[in-house]
Structures are given as C-alpha cells and as structure tokens.
C-alpha cells in the first residue's frame, strides 16, 4: 500500500526562523496537501507537478518548494508564534494517504529551553477520523504540545 514518509516528527524553532517539512511517497500521486491540524483543519499548500501550487494566504510569500510531488520539501519561512501546530502531508492517489505529522514549535527566543521536541513522533490527540477510503498510520498524528513548565505561559 502507498505510504507517506514525513519528516521531521518534531522541530523547535525561534520566531522568524524557517522550517523544512519533507513528504516522500513511492510515486503515483495526483498531488499532495500540507495541512495544519486542529478543530478547523487548514490547508497550507496543495502541490501538483506541472501546476502552480496553491498556498494559503497566511503563508503567501513565505513558502518555498523543492523536489517533486513524490518527494517534496516544503520550506516555511519567517515563522510566527501562531504557526505552532501539527502539519500533516496528505497524498492524493486513488485513496487519501496521510503522513505521520510534524509538530512545529515556534518559540520566543528566550523560551526555547522550555519547549523542545522529544524523539517520539507527535502523540495522538483529538483529530478527526480519516475518511473511510483513506490510509492513515496508527497512531494518528498529534497536535498536542509538550507540557510546559508550570511557570510558563504558552503563546
């Protein structure tokens, strides 16, 4: 069955920095979405070889692509605190196939030590169930942030 390899699992970056998310498949795609998860999932990009990519207005002017739809690296620039979240690749084939997710933690420079990624993939959270015609890795991607120290305030 088709799979999407997504990396990294998690990354911590300061405000204003960039992050690379790579979505790799064995080919045979119609295209690929990068979606920010949450109660109201938000498409960030849709990329299809030979077609002008669609980019959400929030990220317009700060997204770059390299590679092809089968092995796509998406670079998000000038990250803001509000960009913190879990991003998942959705490959469109004859079914929907999902990556394992990338948890992006955007921190103010002085608070970087408070929130850092563990080695584990993003942990499962209250995500919508995938469509029935979909292939989704188990466990599902996570959108939960690591627990901060009691004294800290998350943005």
């Amino acid at each position: 069955a088709q799979e999407v390899q997504q990396s990294p699992h998690c990354t911590t970056v300061p405000v204003g920095a960039s992050v690379n998310i790579t979505c790799s498949t064995s080919g045979g795609l119609r295209g690929i979405y990068l979606r920010q998860l949450g109660p109201q999932p938000q498409d960030i990009i849709y990329y299809e070889d030979g077609v002008v990519p669609t980019t959400d207005r929030r990220f317009r002017g700060r997204i770059d692509f390299s590679g092809s739809q089968d092995n796509l690296t998406i670079t998000m620039h000038r990250l803001q605190l509000s960009d913190t979240g879990t991003y998942t690749c959705q490959a469109i084939t004859e079914v929907n196939v999902y990556g394992s997710g990338t948890l992006v933690l955007v921190t103010e420079e002085q608070s970087q030590g408070w929130h850092r990624c563990s080695d584990a993939p993003p942990r499962a959270s209250a995500l919508p169930a995938p469509p029935t015609g979909s292939a989704l890795p188990d466990p599902q991607t996570a959108s939960a942030l690591p627990d901060p120290p009691a004294a800290s305030a998350l943005p």
Partner: antibody, heavy 117, light 107 residues
Framework: EVQLVESGGGLVKPGGSLRLSCAAS????????MSWVRQAPGKGLEWVAS???????YYADSVKGRFTISRDNAKNSLYLQMNSLRAEDTAVYYC???????????WGQGTLVTVSS | DIQMTQSPSSLSASLGDRVTITCSAS??????LNWYQQKPGKVPKLLIY???SLHSGVPSRFSGSGSGTDYTLTISSLQPEDVATYYC?????????FGGGTKVEIK
Amino acid sequence: EVQLVESGGGLVKPGGSLRLSCAASGLTFSSYAMSWVRQAPGKGLEWVASISSGGFTYYADSVKGRFTISRDNAKNSLYLQMNSLRAEDTAVYYCARDEVRGYLDVWGQGTLVTVSS
Amino acid sequence: DIQMTQSPSSLSASLGDRVTITCSASQGISNYLNWYQQKPGKVPKLLIYYTSSLHSGVPSRFSGSGSGTDYTLTISSLQPEDVATYYCQQYSKLPYTFGGGTKVEIK
C-alpha cells in the same frame, strides 16, 4: 448512515442572489472534502465547486467570481453563496461528499434553483 | 479542460442482455474515472470508482475497465432496476468533468 440534506433553493430573478446549505450527518464532516454538482432540467451533471477538508476552494469556470463555496465544520454544514445569478444557473444543486478529490460517493437529495424574471 | 465523450447516448436492450457503455477522455486520465447511475427522478449514485472498483452495495453484475483515455462500464445481465442514465466522470484534473450520459431502457 451518512446523510446530506440541501436547502435554500427557490425562485430568484436574474442578477439576484441565493445561499444554499447542506447539512451533513453520520460522518466526521471535517475530514472530508465536499462538492456541489448541478443538473439543469433534462440535462446532464455539471461539477460546480469543491472545498477541501482544509478549506481550499475550487470552481468551474462558469461560476468563478459569482459563486463562493464555504464550510462550517462546527455546524457540519456546507454552503454555496450564489450571486449574479443567470438563467443558465437554473438547475437542481446537489451537495456531495468528496471522498478522494473528485470521487463523489454520497449525494444529497438536491435543491432546485430557478432563475427567471 | 478534459472532455468526456460517452457513447451511445441511449440504448435499448432486453432483460438478461450484456450492456456496454463507453467513455472516452480527451487526454489520459490515469484510471481516475467514476461511473454514476441516476434513476428517473432520483439522485445520482456512485457505482464504480477508480475505473474498476465497485462501490459498496453495488451488484456484481456491474463492472468497469479501461486505461489511458478509453473506459467501459459493463452490465453483465440487464435487470429491470437497471433502467437509468449512466454518467462517467473524470477526476484526474480539475475541473471534474462528466460525460453526457447514456440512457438505458428495456426493450
């Protein structure tokens, strides 16, 4: 059981506006792309618009700039705002669950929009 | 846009007959083809997706085949409840486009 129920159709004059709604039940609405397809009286099917689960929107050239598709995941609802309506927009409008970017596996019962002076 | 040409536009066959409907795309669609059935006065229903996959609950007398630009829907043994209009639809590229339909009647 997955159910889609359209509403909001009716008679409108050319140049007028109408907002169609589609209430979904029996599915995790936020996980699915959704589409509108129309069928003019005695004619075939025509795709109108789609919205991905993450909110990207796509339109047929015939409605681009006049129609707006939107969704409210909290209300399990899909919408089609139709402006500057023309006689040729007269049709039954169906909402459909878009299982895999174009594979429309569940359809509502349809709502009739008539544009006439 | 990808044009979908369906033929015949209508046909009349006897109960038990094998019925074949064809759909031709103006460019290759990589098997991203669906077939829908619409009975008179009713809502379209998905029959076959991705060229040959039978949608749940669809009788096994329906089958689909094809590749590239040419696709076929076959009803192996026509039944009274198969009286309907059948539409093909490509979903390889936006905009999604439908064939003009084939009306199937019983002789």
